[in-house]
Amino acid sequence: FERTRSLQDPCSNCPAGTFCDNNRNQICSPCPPNSFSSAGGQRTCDICRQCKGVFRTRKECSSTSNAECDCTPGFHCLGAGCSMCEQDCKQGQELTKKGCKDCCFGTFNDQKRGICRPWTNCSLDGKSVLVNGTKERDVVCGPSPADLSPGASSVTPPAPAREPGHSPQ
């Protein structure tokens, strides 16, 4: 790297991936290993983020850009830039301070992360429960009881069995 000769700031011509080295009379020196500078004119290179523990490297550090991390299997990212890794739970569970716990009756979680949420209250929309909720799934609301003809059930009857050899459409 040639020494820059700018009259204003001798460091201004140092490109990304280098730093202006005061120990070497302000010559542009390449960033040391495991460090980077993403813009020109830098007086230091930033040390690369190290993806360790529950973090794993999603993108390697280069001389001009920082490393990016995600989470090891069984964990998922939280926050911008994957600042934290949180343990996965099964569907039908939520993560508490004591670990993964099943959703309480009347609540569900259809993901491996997040909290258990209450089943939808169909009656608030004037509807009836078409399919009951579980720990993993919300209820399915159907038409309002008034919309049903007399004698009709609010739960759909089972679909007829398909004939062998027919694939679903």
């Epitope: 290993p33 495991n34 230091t44 930033d46 040390i47 690369c48 983020r49 190290q50 993806c51 360790k52 523990g53 490297t57 920082n66 939280l78 926050g79 911008a80 830039g81 600042s83 934290m84």
Partner: antibody, heavy 118, light 112 residues
């Protein structure tokens, strides 16, 4: 270049809460971890905890019940609160930019001495 | 937590002579990515600590090349090839493998 500046009262009474703010200039608070580290007079360094700009925190277990760290990205600041202080909390308090979430403190504030005394 | 132990705690050195500081960790700092997660810091009198070495052996940008770090696993060394008057202060090793990061007790380097 990145500069950090601690601010807050230099004297706190026992049992009260110590509050400090670190202002980051010359760069954005985004995309890094930001730590608090303290040093009692004539002694060594103790890491207290970090915050990511998104608000995620990690606190030293030895201080967990007493420490709160928060961030204000609009002001490029992060803050430390230490409750129920005693004379043992008298120290120089440093804020620092943490490159990896618990490692390689590349940029430090100049430190501020907080004395706990009645 | 990981305990860091430094020796010696005091190191009188003649200018121009080499100096060496040892740091030992209570468990290995070698991670599966092949890096030793150990930093070295220098705190000059009345100043904040400054990073010298990261990942065991990488000199931070702007740090003079008379400083070098070596070692792996649990045993690490900071060497100064020729001590200068401006190198006086307290040197700390720090493990950056696990939270909480922990520091050694410090080694005070002084000029004879």
């Amino acid at each position: 270049q990145v500069q950090l500046q601690e601010s807050g009262p230099g004297l706190v009474k026992p049992s009260e809460t110590l509050s400090l703010t670190c202002t980051v200039s010359g760069g954005s608070i985004s995309s890094y971890y930001w730590s608090w580290i303290r040093q009692p007079p004539g002694k060594g360094l103790e890491w207290m905890g970090y915050i990511y700009y998104s608000g995620s925190t990690n606190i030293n277990p030895s201080l967990k019940s007493r420490v709160t760290i928060s961030v204000d990205t609009s002001k490029n600041q992060f803050s430390l609160k230490l409750s129920s202080v005693t004379a043992a909390d008298t120290a120089v308090y440093y804020c620092a930019r943490d490159q990896s979430g618990g490692g390689s403190f590349q940029h430090w504030g100049q430190g501020t001495l907080v004395t706990v005394s009645s | 937590e990981i305990v860091m132990t430094q020796s010696p705690l005091s190191l009188p050195v003649t200018p121009g002579e080499p100096a060496s500081i040892s740091c030992r960790s209570s468990q290995s700092l070698l991670y599966s990515n092949g890096y030793n997660h150990l930093d070295w810091y220098l705190q000059k009198p009345g100043q904040s600590p400054q990073l010298l070495i990261y990942l065991g052996s990488n000199r931070a940008s702007g740090v003079p090349d008379r400083f070098s770090g070596s070692g792996s696993g649990t045993d690490f060394t900071l060497k100064i090839s020729r001590v200068e008057a401006e190198d006086v202060g307290v040197y700390y090793c720090m493990q950056a493998l696990q939270t909480p990061p922990t520091f050694g007790q410090g080694t005070k380097l002084e000029i004879k």
